[in-house]
């Protein structure tokens, strides 16, 4: 099984023990590590994003001297990059060709084994351009193989939301040109629903409405397969972060009304999102519940509510992906797991390690 783990370059800016650099990654933890994110320059070439990306690329790829089987990929795009710029590049032959031709030399120069596309998210008019972009990247990667130089890997991070899938992806077409698909089976539930809910339930909940039946890992995986994605190329996304809400009343169960996103974490400083190492802290004195249908936990403390993953829930998810004969798991993100071993002393990356152990 593959265990594909994302590293985020901005995690270096978190304060104190929250700061994370690639050399903190255990070399044998994951089979593939994806560095997020690279940029695309004004002349449509793959390029660095952070001032010290080159140094961090080097730190990441040095892990391969210890684990020679480790593969590294560079992810291009992301939320800040936006879908508009991707659309401008993919929809124009000249721009798209310039980008496609720039990718392999860039990856080779910095020691990466492949590219991950994080176009978040293609709109209806971009659907065919996204397919074309993937097809052309794969063709370029095939063409540039030479003895002593293996073919570069190509993956894509795809939304697990039904609307986004139907709108932006021709699954049958893109799946044949990708080595694997990173299915983002999280962020299913958010503040827009105005009630509490887990953002990555394995199965549909008993109380779920008609729309909610799409908002779970099981549905997304089965739907992708139905649309033509080979199970052997699908990686099920498992989050090491939780989604939090501020409760609107004393009601604190699943489906309780909310007034907004949860308070920002001490280190991640983003309302509505908590790293696992922040959740550990939150759990002290909190009320913990396990959703029997959804197979995931949530916790409440005061007016704060958080849906998250623990060792038990990730093991359940791995059991599911094995049953469905998927390619493996994807983790977002290493820097949001307890990489310092603060939850339980000397236990580093507990969630990712639990996934690794369950995959074995």
């Amino acid at each position: 099984y593959k265990l594909v783990c994302y590293f985020t370059s901005w995690s270096q800016y978190r304060e104190g023990v929250g700061s994370f650099l690639p050399d903190a990654i255990q070399p044998f933890l994951c089979t593939h590590i994806i560095y997020s994110f690279a940029n695309i320059s004004s002349d449509n070439m793959l390029s660095t994003w952070e001032w010290n990306d080159e140094s961090n690329y080097d730190k990441l790829n040095k892990l391969k001297t210890r684990n020679t089987n480790l593969k590294t990929l560079l992810s291009v795009g992301g939320w800040k990059f936006g879908e508009k710029r991707f659309s401008e590049i993919a929809s124009n032959t000249e721009r798209r060709t310039a980008f496609v031709r720039s990718v392999a030399p860039f990856l080779r120069s910095y020691g990466f084994d492949g590219l991950d596309l994080a176009w978040l998210y293609p709109r209806l008019r971009d659907k065919q351009y996204f397919s074309t972009l993937i097809k052309e990247l794969n063709a370029e990667f095939t063409k540039e193989v030479q003895p002593g130089r293996e073919k570069l890997l190509l993956s894509a991070a795809l939304s697990a939301g039904k609307v986004a899938i139907d709108t932006g992806y021709d699954i049958a077409q893109i799946a044949q040109h990708l080595d694997f698909i990173n299915l983002m089976t999280y962020d299913f539930h958010g503040v827009w629903r105005q009630i509490t809910g887990h953002h990555s339930p394995l199965f549909q909940g008993q109380k779920d409405t008609r729309f909610d039946r799409y908002s779970n890992v099981n549905y997304a995986v089965q739907y992708m397969i139905r649309l033509g994605a080979q199970a052997s190329k699908l990686l099920m996304g498992i989050p090491t972060f939780g989604k939090s809400f501020t409760l609107a009343s004393s009601e604190n169960q699943l489906g309780a009304p909310i007034s907004g996103e949860g308070l920002p974490g001490r280190f991640t400083k983003e309302a509505g999102t908590l790293a696992y190492y922040e959740i550990c802290d939150f759990l002290k004195g909190a009320e913990v519940h396990r959703l029997s249908n959804e197979k995931v936990p949530f916790a409440t403390k005061g007016n704060q509510w958080v849906g998250y993953e623990d060792k038990e829930s990730v093991k359940n998810k791995v059991g599911f992906l094995k049953e469905k004969k998927l390619a493996g798991a994807m983790v977002w993100a290493l820097d949001l797991d307890d990489f310092q071993g603060t939850c339980q002393p000397k236990e580093f990356f507990p969630l990712t390690n639990a996934i690794k152990d369950a995959l074995a």
Epitope: S102, A104, G111, Q146
Partner: antibody, heavy 125, light 110 residues
Framework: EVQLVESGGGLVQPGGSLRLSCAAS?????????MCWVRQAPGKGLEWIGC?????????YYADSVKGRFTISKHNSKNTLYLQMTSLRAEDTAVYYC????????????????WGQGTLVTVSS | DIQMTQSPSSLSASVGDRVTITCQAS??????LNWYQQKPGKAPKLLIY???SLASGVPSRFSGSGFGTDFTLTISSLQPEDFATYYC????????????FGGGTKVEIK
Amino acid sequence: EVQLVESGGGLVQPGGSLRLSCAASGFTISSDYYMCWVRQAPGKGLEWIGCIYIGSGTDTYYADSVKGRFTISKHNSKNTLYLQMTSLRAEDTAVYYCARDKGWSNAWGFYFQLWGQGTLVTVSS
Amino acid sequence: DIQMTQSPSSLSASVGDRVTITCQASQSIGKYLNWYQQKPGKAPKLLIYSSSSLASGVPSRFSGSGFGTDFTLTISSLQPEDFATYYCQQGYSYVDLENGFGGGTKVEIK
């Protein structure tokens, strides 16, 4: 001493054929190497002709200007590289160099670290 | 097909001068750009590989930089033995390649 020595050059008529040899000494043409031919017309710049990947002996790459006319091959036991040239033209007149590329690595790419002294081929009637 | 364009084609300079030669690739080649020095009647000699790595035995007055499509060879203080012709070469691919070398830059005594 590690060196490459070309031979086989000379005067040939247009339409004729010639086989150049490149003998490697001081090292064995190992499986990771690419062995290549580069030429230089009198008073002109360097022009890449083609390469062979020694590891397979079947992976060959040629410039469009010589494709179908020139063939690169190797003889393992003789530690020798060959350039078979057919349908020669006046514009093929040049000094022909044999060069060694140690093989691809992301760290360094392709480059010619070792060159022969060159052999002159003159195509004229 | 990757084309290499070198400029200038020739330049005149004096001993002690700082000399800069540029090379442009028709498409991105990452860091894979090499520089060679050639003297009359001699085979080319590798100076720099992978854009900025100095070949063995090459004096430190030679340096290279660049990434993608634009590259530079700099001789910080020209010495009498540096008067020669310099060639850039893309070191990225042998596939679908027409030449791979730039046209050359002849460095002459002013």
